[in-house]
Interface confidence: medium
């Protein structure tokens, strides 16, 4: 027995591997992360790697725990522990010079850059109060919400996130679907453009004033987020162009000529004035209507008693009880009405402070022979964005035997955001009033210049003699075409046998906002299934793909690839696409310098290693050679002189063969050209139990054998000429196989180093 004592020698210099510099806030103290400054040394520990620094130009270096004491040196171990801090002061751009030492060798002349950034501060101006008319849409404006930053950030980059949305209405974007998802994000630029809208939704119960809040978070990296609350006041007090009345209802009345009609709370209702009184006292209050101008063609009666200048009052409670009647005096169908003032009345008829309003109530007298118009079923208008389409009787028509088309008038009550109605010859702008004659003659058209979502026109239609009837016109904006984008095949990790689809595999794009697409499997995969929620499926949505919910799983492990075909459907347009599936081999492949031409090198786990696949599957992975190498061959080599000679050509082998060192790669010389570097490759199929096979390739560079060069793989033989030069005559076997003892004259063998060298050269 003999003992070998290996004495450590510090003969390797330290190497600076990372020096990315540090970015920090102005005036702050921050750790210098090990990811920003790192060095390695093959024979020194991190505590022996010392950085010696000069005075930094824009701050000082201190150690955590002693922030008041400046240091001039620190170790890699301290960096790794996050103990080295830089305290910034002075110029924004600077740093320090340093040298690196392991105690034996020094690497001088380095510079670590420290860049400080000015703190960016966000501020919110504007009233942060929005006043909205009941039931209306109000854009947020810069008066309401105005963010700015100390860095003068572009308003496009000032982002609001809706932390808590409104309770009494909703927030939406003028250019997007006004019926879909609640708005989550918007920018200051969109506020400036008037594109962010608050819509108040009328509640079933009357109110005088209501308050809503939106909780927002303003962000614009790198600044700190700022919380904001936007108060919304919804009040009948405000003057509203969209709603001329301050009452809960003031709709007017239609009465047949010479007849009488009850004015009910469906037509006139001041219960919102009552709602301004706290509910415990509400029962003691009423609303007093004082008629300031009486009807000219008829009479108002309360409990069958006529109202007159001496008794011009009626109450909300009488109105609610159905006691107010209008009696028409006959003699024509001219318009009638009355003016009134409404205010709160306290207990025992006392006058009280509170909301009040002065308004008119319209009464339309209808010809008794009049037959009201009958709206006909409407077909939605479909057109592509940016186009114009005429509105026909299919969209808007009525049956009215006693009115001409020119007498049937439509009025737009509410328009969608996807375009506008225009009249040929009536100017370019939108129209809000038109007749059935305009529709019938093809003069009315819809111009799709807005958002790319479906929308509905709320219209009222009247023949001038009957009460207006509500109608709607639906407009659907179609993409002119859709395309399924396939950016990459689906790669399935071999050991998992499954993978989630993403937008890389399937994404629908069109000439409009990205549509929500639905996919249907029209040709399923041969070797697997598509799953949603772990269950087989034949249909799924873009949303599910984006969430990573759609999974492809191999169920038949006989192929390294598969494909399936889907039909994508988005807003009435479809397109098909084929998704290719490939398996990514769980194989560690050697990547290193060139291999010597004419030599035989050992194929072992330093070159090809499926050990992880073996562990994951509990099986011995098998390789099948599909292609290559172009110049050379894979052979099985005898491990000892006692084995029968002659290398066998190999087309299949196992991970065990690699680990046993039974395989060699004869690296050939490219024929028909001058000696020099070349490229070659092996294409392999890798199999293991319970997982799909995968195709992998081993790409390698070759060069003429160089006896002075240390090759990083175990060489089983070197070219004949090289052996002779090295004074090692060795004959080849009759098959041309090199003898097993051959090795590189200067063995810098494999990653196994010394032991691999011994193994490769001591078989005999």
């Amino acid at each position: 027995a003999f003992t070998v004592t290996v004495l450590p020698v510090n003969d390797q210099p330290p190497i600076l591997t990372t020096n990315t510099g540090l970015q920090m806030w102005e005036g702050a103290t921050a750790p210098i992360p090990a990811e920003a400054l790192r060095s390695t040394d093959g024979d020194s520990g991190s505590e022996d790697l010392v950085y010696t620094i000069e005075q930094p130009s824009n701050g000082r270096v201190v150690l955590r725990g002693a922030p008041g004491t400046e240091v001039r040196s620190f170790t890699q171990a301290q960096l790794d522990g996050g103990l080295v801090l830089f305290s910034h002061r002075g110029t924004l751009d600077g740093g320090f010079r340093f040298r690196l030492s392991d105690g034996e060798h020094t690497s001088p002349g380095h510079f670590f850059r420290v860049t400080a950034q000015k703190q960016v501060l966000l501020s919110l101006k504007g009233s942060q109060t929005l006043t909205v008319c009941p039931g209306s849409v109000q854009p947020l404006s810069s008066q309401t919400l105005r963010a700015s930053s100390s860095a003068g950030t572009d308003p496009q980059l000032l982002l609001y996130r809706v932390v808590r949305g409104p309770q009494l209405g909703r927030l939406f974007h003028a250019q997007q679907d006004s019926t879909g998802e609640a708005l989550v994000n918007f920018t200051q630029a969109e506020v400036y453009a008037g594109n962010i809208l608050y819509e108040h939704e009328m509640p079933p119960e009357p109110f005088w004033e209501a308050h809503d809040t939106l909780e927002l978070q303003l962000s614009s990296p790198p600044a700190r987020d700022v919380a904001a609350t936007l108060a919304v006041a919804v009040s009948f007090e405000a003057a509203c162009p969209q709603r001329p009345s301050h009452l809960w209802k003031n709709k007017g009345l239609w009465v047949p000529e010479g007849q009488r009609a009850r004015i009910t709370v469906a037509a006139l209702d001041a219960s919102n004035l009552l709602a301004s009184v706290p509910s415990p006292q509400r029962s003691e209050h009423d609303v007093l209507f004082q008629v300031t101008q009486f009807p000219s063609r008829g009479q108002l009666l309360v409990s069958e008693e006529p109202l007159h200048a001496g008794q011009p009052h009626f109450l909300q409670s009488q109105l609610a009880a159905g006691q107010l009647v209008y009696a028409h005096g006959g003699g024509g169908t001219q318009q009638d009405g009355f003016h009134f003032r409404a205010h709160l009345q306290g207990p025992a008829g006392a006058s009280v402070a509170g909301p009040q309003t002065s308004e008119a109530f319209a009464i339309t007298v209808r010809d008794v022979n009049e037959r009201p118009p009958q709206p006909q079923a409407s077909v939605p208008l479909r057109l592509t964005r940016g186009s114009r389409a005429p509105i026909s009787r299919a969209q808007l028509s009525v049956v009215d035997p006693d009115s001409a088309p020119g007498e049937i008038e439509y009025e737009v009550q509410r328009a969608p955001h996807n375009g506008f109605l225009s009249l040929v010859g009536g100017g370019l702008g939108p129209v809000t009033r038109f007749t059935q004659a305009d529709v019938d003659s093809g003069r009315l058209a819809f111009v799709a210049n807005g958002s790319s979502v479906a929308g509905i026109f709320q219209l009222s239609m009247s023949d001038g003699a009957s009460p207006p009837l509500p109608m709607s016109l639906a407009v659907d904006i179609l993409p002119s075409a859709i395309e399924v984008q396939l950016r990459a095949p689906l790669e399935v990790p071999q050991a998992l046998g499954r993978s989630s689809l993403s937008q890389q595999q399937l994404r629908v794009v069109s000439d409009r906002e990205e549509p929500e697409a639905a996919y249907r499997l029209i040709q399923g995969p041969q070797y697997g299934h598509l799953l949603v929620g772990g269950r087989p499926t034949s249909a799924f949505s873009q949303f599910q793909i984006d969430q990573g919910e759609v999974v492809f799983a191999f169920t038949n492990f006989s192929s390294s690839h598969d494909h399936f075909r889907v039909l994508a459907l988005a807003r009435g347009v479809n397109a098909s696409a084929v998704v290719n599936v490939t398996v990514r081999a769980l194989l560690h492949v050697w990547a290193g310098g060139p291999w010597p031409q004419g030599a035989t090198l050992r194929l072992d786990p330093t070159v090809l290693d499926a050990g992880e696949l073996a562990n994951r599957t509990g099986s011995v992975p098998r390789f099948r050679l599909l292609e290559g190498p172009r110049h050379g061959r894979v052979v099985r080599v005898p491990r000892a002189r006692t084995e029968p000679g002659g290398s066998q050509l190999v087309e299949q082998f196992t991970q065990q063969d690699l680990e046993d060192g039974r395989l060699g790669l004869e690296v050939g010389r490219p024929e028909g050209r001058a000696p020099g570097p070349a490229g070659d490759s092996l294409t392999l199929e890798l199999w293991a139990q319970g997982v799909p096979p995968a195709v992998a390739s081993l790409d390698f560079a070759t060069e003429p054998y160089n006896a002075a060069r240390p090759y990083s793989v175990a060489l089983l033989s070197v070219p004949e000429a090289a052996r002779t030069e090295a004074g090692k005559p060795e004959s080849s076997t009759p098959t041309g196989e090199p003898g097993p003892m051959a090795s590189s004259p200067e063995p810098a063998v494999a990653k196994g180093g010394f032991l691999s060298f011994l193994e490769a050269n001591m078989f005999s």
């Epitope: 990790p493 050991a495 998992l496 499954r498 993978s499 989630s500 639905a518 799953l531 949603v532 929620g533 772990g534 269950r535 087989p536 499926t537 249909a539 799924f540 949505s541 949303f543 599910q544 969430q547 990573g548 919910e549 999974v551 994951r616």
Partner: antibody, heavy 112, light 107 residues
Framework: QVQLQESGPGLVKPSQTLSLTCTVS?????????WNWIRQHPGKGLEWIGY???????NYNPSLKSRVTISRDTSKNQFSLKLSSVTAADTAVYYC?????WGQGTLVTVSS | DIQMTQSPSSLSASVGDRVTITCRAS??????LNWYQQKPGKAPKLLIY???SLHSGVPSRFSGSGSGTDFTLTISSLQPEDFATYHC?????????FGQGTKVEIK
Amino acid sequence: QVQLQESGPGLVKPSQTLSLTCTVSGGSITDGYYWNWIRQHPGKGLEWIGYITFDGRNNYNPSLKSRVTISRDTSKNQFSLKLSSVTAADTAVYYCADFDYWGQGTLVTVSS
Amino acid sequence: DIQMTQSPSSLSASVGDRVTITCRASYGIRGYLNWYQQKPGKAPKLLIYYTSSLHSGVPSRFSGSGSGTDFTLTISSLQPEDFATYHCQQYSALPWTFGQGTKVEIK
């Protein structure tokens, strides 16, 4: 057949972090699809907390997202739930499940 | 979030009865619906997935149907071991959500 077993303390103090582990037997956690945590408040319905997938992706319920972390340890065939800043409202039976199979559940009480 | 509403919240029935429980989603869920059975003090058990597919080992008296937003669990002939609470769950869109449960009690 896959079996799941929750483990962790049954009592957690308010403002602390609730930590539970689910041990999977009879199969590998890289074989399932979605390894979920679900909870059930006493006498109430089920609430999905979140999942970790076979390939290590997470999805959480937005109502809990800021407080939840679900992680896995493939070497131990386990996945874990951490719920920070707990209050009495987090008192519930916590289940781990892959939806085909569920753990038996563990009652976690938040109380000082 | 997609809201799942089960009805009724409880029902009383006798052995042999045909029982129907409905589950309504606030948005269309394209059939991505599971049904579970839960007994007191126990974990839920999967009965039906993808609207109508019977999970392995579940008796054939359980069936599921529906589409869009309306779904039904039917027990064709109630057995003593079927008295439990039944939950529906959608997995069409995250977050995955459950119905509030329907308790089936002995009449």
